[in-house]
Structure formats: C-alpha cells, structure tokens
Amino acid sequence: CQSQYCADKARDGICDEACNSHACQWDGGDCSLTMEDPWANCTSTLRCWEYINNQCDEQCNTAECLFDNFECQRNSKTCKYDKYCADHFKDNHCDQGCNSEECGWDGLDCASDQPENLAEGTLIIVVLLPPEQLLQDSRSFLRALGTLLHTNLRIKQDSQGALMVYPYFGEKSAAMKKQKMTRRSLPEEQEQEQEVIGSKIFLEIDNRQCVQDSDQCFKNTDAAAALLASHAIQGTLSYPLVSVFSELESPRNAQ
C-alpha cells in the first residue's frame, strides 16, 4: 500500500473505499470488521479476494478461502416466500415451504428431532444495537447472518443458561484515539456513567442442516468470521457490525 493518504486513514474507524484493498489491509481493518486479512489462511494460488466475481473459481472453493463467496453453488436460489419465511423463522413451528438452504432451513424448526452439529468455536460479534433491541430482533439478526454464512446460528448460553448478549460500551483503543477523538463532547471526568452503544454477542454455528444439503459448511468459526469480514469489505452487511472474532476455545462466561 503505497499511498500516504491510506497510511493516514488506516485504523481510524472509518472505511474509506480508496483504501479498501488487500494491499492496504482493507483500510487497516476499517472496512473489514477490524480483521486485516480475512484470507490469511487461504493457500490457493489465486488471490481469492479478487475473485468475488459471480462465477465459480474452484481453487477458492474451500473454507479457508471463504468458499469463493459461495459462488460455486450449483442451485443458488433466493427464498421464494422470503417475507413469510422471515416472519416464521425459528418460531418452533415447521414450515416446509421455508425448509431450504435459501430460506435458512426455517431456523431449524423442521430439524428439532435431529442432533445438533456444532462447528468448533464461538463467533464473537460487536454490533451497534443495544442488547434489548438486538434480543428483540434476534430472529432477524440470526437469519441475516445465517443467510450470509449459508448455515444456522444461535446465541450461546452461559453456564447458567443465560443468553450471552452483553452491553458494549465502546473501546478507548489507540485506533479510536488516533485523531484525539472522544466519543462524546464531554470531559473525561464526566464520562463515569458509560453509555451502552451496542452489544457483544456470542454465537454458535449449528450445521445440522448444512451438512445434509451442502459440502460448504464451516467446521470452525474462524472462516465464518472471515467470511463476515469479507461481506463488510463488499458493503453487503445489513446490520451495523463493528468487529468479528472467532474464539476456538471459548470460556463460557467471558465478557
């Protein structure tokens, strides 16, 4: 990344399209949910980030290469009754018209008698919606992410059985301070009562339906996290995600 402009703009918390390239680490992670190289584990001879082109490139069709952005699916369809299926997703009632990959397998409503098939690890996502709003909208949120990942997700539970969705107060990181920025126009001493600006949500991937219909399922959450980062790069996320991490050995009570 030769550009001084991009060197100045990297890691400032704003995605600048002129710097949204592999060479510039996707604007230092600003365009990629803080992940500077979603294709880091991709060993293909192709630069797979350059092959998100609506055609199948088999050399990129591996989990590590993010399944070529699912461009190798033979029967890529859109959900026929999308509004109905969205309204009836994960409502504990099986709707066969929604029980397909493109409709998110009805949120596993038709597979309640099947054993779970969990991918290894946990997806940890920071989203700029407060916990009460995110929980209220959790079915839509899980469906939206599941659609991108072509599998099903669920909110992880802690050892007490509580859903692992926690308030997020923002981070006073070096990146945020890069331009002497403050989240609010208040002096430091007045910021004792921190404001909830989002949620940190812990998610698990359940592949029980994916493995029956596809060979493009994530065995662990690393590549799933990277795929979400690649969607951020493309600007195709429908929720205001801030960061995504994968934790392969996740403590159940981490906040």
């Epitope: 704003i14 600048d16 399209e17 002129a18 919606l129 920025m181 205001p240």
Partner: antibody
Framework: EVQLVESGGGLVQPGGSLRLSCAAS????????MSWVRQAPGKGLEWVSY????????YYADSVKGRFTISADTSKNTAYLQMNSLRAEDTAVYYC???????????????WGQGTLVTVSS | DIQMTQSPSSLSASVGDRVTITCRAS??????LAWYQQKPGKAPKLLIY???SRASGVPSRFSGSGSGTDFTLTISSLQPEDFATYYC?????????FGQGTKVEIK
Amino acid sequence: EVQLVESGGGLVQPGGSLRLSCAASGYSFTSYGMSWVRQAPGKGLEWVSYIYPYSGATYYADSVKGRFTISADTSKNTAYLQMNSLRAEDTAVYYCARHSGYYRISSAMDVWGQGTLVTVSS
Amino acid sequence: DIQMTQSPSSLSASVGDRVTITCRASQSISSYLAWYQQKPGKAPKLLIYGASSRASGVPSRFSGSGSGTDFTLTISSLQPEDFATYYCQQYYSSPLTFGQGTKVEIK
C-alpha cells in the same frame, strides 16, 4: 421517520465563532456517519466535514481544517459543527446529512436536514 | 482531490422530453457516485447511489449509468416536478466532492 434538524445558524462577525447542531431521530445515531455540507448563496454544494459517531473519527475539507471541529454526542443523538475564525467566504446554508453505509464515508448521503443559514459579515 | 465536472451547466427542456446529464471524474471512482436533486430553498434529495441504483421512493424515470470516470443521469420523460438543479457527487475518497450542478429549466 428518520429526521435531521439543524439549528444554531445566524449572523456573526468575521473572526467570530458559531456552533451548529444537528439533532437526529428515527434511527440508530451511533451506527451511521454524518456529514456537514454547505451551500453559499447561488452556488453549488461543498462538503465540509464527516464524523462516525461510534468511533468519533473525523474528516475535514482543507478549506475548514484547523478552524472547524465536528463532534457528536451519542447520548443526545446530536452532531455539532463548531466554527471558529469565521470568514466571509464561510457564509452559506449548512446542511447535515446522514451517510447510508454505517461506518463508510464511502457511501451516499440519504437523509438531509432542512439547513441553517450562517452569515459572516461586519 | 478528485474533481467532478458536470455538463451541461444548464439546459432548457419541455415536459415529456428525455434529458441526459453527464458527470466526469478526474480519476476512476469505480461506481462510488451519487446524484442529488435540489429545488430552490430546499435540501438536496438523493436520487441515485452506486452510479445506477435508485434511492427509495425515486420514480423509475430517473436512471443512472456509468463507472470509472464517466457517468450519466437520464430522466426518460421529464415531469413538471423535475425542474430543479442536479448534482453528482463522488464518495470514493475524502474529500467528498460534488459537480458544479446542472440546472434543468422549462423551455
């Protein structure tokens, strides 16, 4: 309904200061970038500054750098433009505008306020 | 900085006419271009984003095309409410820049 309402405009002498406010409602203020855009009388549109309220990160046009400061108070869902060392050429209607793409300055401005007039004159 | 050049700066047309406005960027901006409509005393209104996508509620007579450096806004059949000033804007990199505007007047 998504809405932006500017206030704080008025008449100010050269060298003076003014603070504009942009009150946002109807959406998650923290999630979307906000710009100030101005329009001098009878002229075209000029982008002034951008802020992403979540991180507080800011960008400025060269013409205002060092004189104007953009900020956001996420508890009040309000963006501000502090204008110091004002010049006659800063006379314009100032609009705040929301960017459509979360953390991306590289997105169109899909919602605009009604504008507030700033006149710099002695 | 990326310069945006619009042409023509003004045009006269009649209701029902097909109107074309062009916008040229001083360097490639891919498809990071928006078109806005502004009526006197009012705020600009987003018409087109991503060079060719219509914003919500914008009538189908408005269309955008182009990528790289050359872009076009077309109004297929001019309506009385379309007489206004139109601006293109690049959002590929900071500083964000606008074209100088095209005023569409009644012939």
